[in-house]
């Protein structure tokens, strides 16, 4: 009686269970009676990464420079390549199709987390004690003058974007 | 039956052309690369080309016979073609179309063409 | 373009010799396995022998043996018989963008 089920790593086809093609491989001929499925390397451009029944090998995917993408790890007969952003830039979807620049953080806020080529800038504000006054996707929040350590007193209070402002101390005459 | 039948060999003369039919049964059309091979009288065997599974079709050709032969199929009439054009003394051969692409694990019994003025 | 060269291009044995016909490729076939022996008497289709250079389909009997890898294959029949006698082909296929298959010229097995 003919198979109605076949086993992992096969397919049904004329009622009799055909071996799956390995991965890197794709389906030339099916399996006969007589003889195992035929299955041929996928050429060097092209990947397959399961087991499979496909006539076709899927293209590697092209890390496009002019959207300011490049390659990560090539890919292989049995892995898609995998394109990352130049310097400066991250991707803008999981699956990185284009590249945009990173964020800066505005005063008043400073970086959390630097950038990637997956991910963007993340922004904190600054903490009371913590001042930032410029735009940048490197610098962290950075800590207030002390004014006591300099034997100095603070003459205007610091702010998120501003370091406090330290002066002489008044002497008594 | 698993088989493969061609037809439309015949006498022809040079510079025409010819059609030649292979019509499967027995299996998933579809999903089978299909090829033809030639075989002039009294010599060896001689790949003229193949056409791959898959709805685009992809198609490989000896290099003598790339410009001249075509390799098409048609799924709904699971039927494979060779149009043969500009033909020479030299294709005279009996022509089998055969399952599979780089072993072959089905053949016609073959259709003669003699290409002769 | 691949090209096979096959040898001896005919030879006479006995039945019950042993008899190995080589099978030399220009190039490496694909994946190193891609070479099919087949067997053609006169009047008739051939007929698929090995494959994956070693791989007998079922029914093919167990006399008949494929070794090689790359450029170099061999075809032995161990104990030869009388239905035995017919040209054999080797056919490499090197890939699916430069001129997929060749045969060889053939060896034809003759009674001695």
């Known amino acids: 009686e003919p198979p109605t089920a076949c086993r992992e790593k096969q397919y049904l086809i004329n009622s009799q269970c055909c071996s799956l093609c390995q991965p890197g491989q794709k389906l030339v001929s099916d399996c006969t009676e007589f003889t195992e499925t035929e299955c041929l390397p996928c050429s060097e451009s092209e990947f397959l990464d399961t087991w499979n029944r496909e006539t076709r090998c899927h293209q590697h995917k092209y890390c496009d420079p002019n959207l300011g993408l490049q390659v990560q790890q090539k890919g292989t007969s049995e892995t898609d390549t995998i394109c990352t952003c130049e310097e400066g830039l991250h991707c803008t979807s999981e699956s990185c199709e284009s590249c945009v620049p990173h964020r800066s953080c505005l005063p008043g806020f400073g970086v959390k987390q630097i950038a990637t080529g997956v991910s963007d800038t993340i922004c904190e504000p600054c903490p009371v004690g913590f001042f930032s006054n410029v735009s940048s996707a490197f610098e962290k929040c950075r800590p207030w003058t002390s004014c006591e350590t300099k034997d100095l007193v603070v003459q205007q209070a610091g702010t998120n974007k501003t370091d406090v402002v330290c002066g002489p101390q008044d002497r008594q005459r | 039956e698993v088989q493969l039948e061609e037809s439309g060999g015949g006498l022809v003369q040079p510079g025409g052309s010819l059609r030649l039919s292979c019509a499967a049964s027995?299996?998933?059309?579809?999903?089978?690369?299909m090829s033809w091979v030639r075989q002039a009288p009294g010599k060896g065997l001689e790949w003229v080309g193949t056409?791959?599974?898959?709805?685009?079709?992809?198609?490989d050709y000896a290099s003598w016979a790339k410009g001249r032969f075509t390799i098409s199929k048609d799924t709904s009439k699971t039927t494979l073609y060779l149009q043969m054009n500009s033909l020479r003394a030299e294709d005279t051969a009996t022509y089998f179309c055969?399952?599979?692409?780089?072993?072959?694990?089905?053949w016609g019994q073959g259709t003669l063409v003699t290409v002769s003025s | 373009d691949i090209v096979m060269t096959q040898s001896p291009s005919s030879l006479s044995a006995s039945v019950g010799d042993r008899v190995t016909i080589t099978c030399q490729a220009s190039?490496?076939?694909?994946?190193?396995?891609?070479l099919a022996w087949y067997q053609q008497k006169p009047g008739q289709a051939p007929k698929l022998l090995i494959y994956?250079?070693?791989t007998l389909p079922s029914g093919v009997p167990s006399r008949f043996s494929g070794s090689g890898s790359g450029t170099d294959f061999t075809l032995t029949i161990s104990s030869l018989q009388p239905e035995d006698f017919a040209t054999y082909y080797c056919?490499?296929?090197?890939?699916?963008?430069?001129?997929?298959?060749?045969f060889g010229q053939g060896t034809k097995v003759v009674i001695k």
């Open positions: 994956l250079a070693s």
């Open positions: 027995g299996f998933d059309f579809s999903s089978n690369a």
């Open positions: 056409i791959y599974a898959g709805s685009n079709g992809n198609t």
């Open positions: 055969a399952r599979g692409a780089s072993y072959f694990t089905l």
């Open positions: 056919a490499g296929y090197k890939s699916s963008s430069t001129d997929g298959t060749a």
């Open positions: 190039e490496s076939v694909v994946s190193n396995n891609r």
